[in-house]
């Protein structure tokens, strides 16, 4: 393992001394450190026209270390590289450069994008969403009874969030109106006071509905006769069928 030849010796330079500072084992007035104490790294720093030897506990930024049997030596990385494994492979680039496969580039190749946190070129990642869930039960104000027209919802999950240049995510929730066979709420489903309050409020809404084509929001109306009600229901069912044929749906976007 030992070096076969060319080991630096103190005879190399007339001004070699062993009264050195900063981790040097041998040094000279002109060249600084010539060799280092055990476990320290020898690095040549250029100062003007001359190179000065320095001994450090680890290699500085822009250098990598090799532990030879007789010397621990720092070698310069390529100019645009801040940290490297060896001459060929950079692991962190200098500011303004992006790392790609061990090289430092000023912009990322086609099909890749710059990650400005890691300063690396990474693959563009597109959004991936799951399949839609089944439609929820037809509901109105959190209940599945006491109304004829409500809304139903379906959702999906984002499986993969996109990177900066990736395709955006689609809506994760979709809502549409629905019609059900009206059924009265059982006693357990609403209280007396609530029923009275709702009836008053809903009567107002029913009046509104006779003069508009908005969704039916009411329970039974105390104003309409059963015949009127039946007529109205038939009309609304026809409208609903026509709407279903057109497959109109209202999308509520929750884009991630």
């Amino acid at each position: 393992q030992n070096a076969s030849r060319g080991r630096r010796q103190r005879r190399m330079h007339p001004n070699v001394s062993q009264g050195c500072q900063g981790g040097c084992a041998t040094c000279s007035d002109y060249n600084g450190c010539l060799s280092c104490k055990p476990r320290l790294f020898f690095v040549l720093e250029r100062i003007g026209m001359k190179q000065i030897g320095v001994c450090l506990s680890s290699c500085p930024s822009g250098y990598y270390g090799t532990r030879y049997p007789d010397i621990n030596k720092c070698t310069k990385c390529k100019v645009d590289c801040d940290t490297c494994f060896n001459k060929n492979f950079c692991t962190k680039c200098k500011s303004g450069f992006y790392l790609h496969l061990g090289k430092c580039l000023d912009s990322c190749p086609e099909g890749l994008e710059a990650n400005n946190h890691t300063m690396e070129c990474v693959s563009i990642v597109h959004c991936e969403a799951s399949e839609w869930s089944p439609w929820s039960p037809c509901m109105k104000k959190g209940k599945t009874c006491g109304f004829k027209r409500g809304t139903e919802t379906r959702v999906r999950d984002i499986l993969q969030h996109p990177s900066a240049k990736g395709n955006l995510c689609p809506p994760t929730s979709e809502t549409r109106t629905c019609i059900v066979q009206r059924k009265k709420c059982s006693k357990g489903e609403r209280g007396k006071k609530g029923r009275e309050r709702k009836r008053k409020k809903l009567n107002k809404e029913e009046r509104k509905e006779t003069s508009s084509s908005s969704d039916s929001k009411g329970l039974e109306s105390s104003i309409e006769t059963p015949d009127q009600q039946e007529n109205k229901e038939r009309q609304q069912q026809q409208k609903r069928r026509a709407r279903d044929k057109q497959q109109k749906s209202v999308s509520v976007s929750t884009v991630h």
Epitope: Q1, S4, R67, Y68, D70, F85, K87, N88, F89
Partner: antibody
Framework: EVQLVESGGGVVQPGRSLRLSCAAS????????MAWVRQAPGKGLEWVAT????????YFGDSVRGRFTISRDNSKNTLYLQMNSLRAEDTAVYYC?????????WGQGTMVTVSS | DIQMTQSPSSLSASVGDRVTITCLVS??????FVWYQQKPGKAPKLLIY???RLQDGVPSRFSGSGSGTDFTLTISSLQPEDFATYYC?????????FGQGTKLEIK
């Protein structure tokens, strides 16, 4: 394109000598430490020797120290391995390789057979 | 010298399998660690350097992990061209030492 081409292998009797050469192209030869790595038939990889970029220092594996010498001619982009006092256990494919902590570039190898 | 213990020494697997090879090192080497692939009759080829960095041209199904004394090479979905012998190497200090190799064979 990086190319390392070994030559000089062959069949040799125990105790005799052989000199391997490796011609390099496609990279700055004088910037790299160069090494020889060998592989006995059906066995794993074994580092043999490394010479630093300027030829001033060389290092050897325990099994070859004192018998093998490594040298280089940067003007000719060529690496050498002088193998003396060869033994049967030196039988292997010898690869020339650029050694910079990892072995980044490899030649195709040259077979050395030591047999009486 | 730093000792490298690679396991398993051989492994049978099928195309599409996920495969893991490990290398234990006798002392802490940080991430100064390399993986090579060698096919019969060919020279070794550097796959991964600095424990986890892929060499240019190496498919992304290969990945390396670990630091200190425990290192792993994973092939996420084996392809026919991946059947070869894999070696680990420590690049922390001289002398450079290799693992014994893992021969990956078709089941």
């Amino acid at each position: 394109e990086v190319q390392l081409v070994e030559s000089g292998g062959g069949v040799v009797q125990p105790g005799r000598s052989l000199r391997l050469s490796c011609a390099a192209s496609g990279f700055t030869f004088s910037d790299y430490d160069m090494a020889w790595v060998r592989q006995a038939p059906g066995k794993g990889l074994e580092w043999v020797a490394t010479i630093i970029y300027d030829g001033s220092r060389a290092y050897f594996g325990d099994s070859v120290r004192g018998r093998f010498t490594i040298s280089r001619d940067n003007s000719k982009n060529t690496l050498y391995l002088q193998m003396n006092s060869l033994r049967a256990e030196d039988t292997a494919v010898y690869y020339c390789t650029a050694h910079d902590r990892s072995f980044d570039y490899w030649g195709q190898g040259t077979m050395v057979t030591v047999s009486s | 010298d730093i000792q490298m213990t690679q396991s398993p020494s051989s492994l049978s697997a099928s195309v599409g399998d996920r495969v893991t090879i490990t290398c234990l090192v006798s002392e802490d080497i940080s991430n100064d660690f390399v993986w090579y692939q060698q096919k019969p009759g060919k020279a070794p080829k550097l796959l991964i350097y600095a424990a986890s960095r892929l060499q240019d041209g190496v498919p992304s199904r290969f990945s390396g992990s670990g630091s200190g004394t425990d290192f792993t090479l994973t092939i996420s979905s084996l392809q026919p061209e991946d059947f070869a012998t894999y070696y680990c190497q420590q690049s922390y200090k001289y002398p450079p030492t290799f693992g014994q190799g893992t021969k990956l064979e078709i089941k």
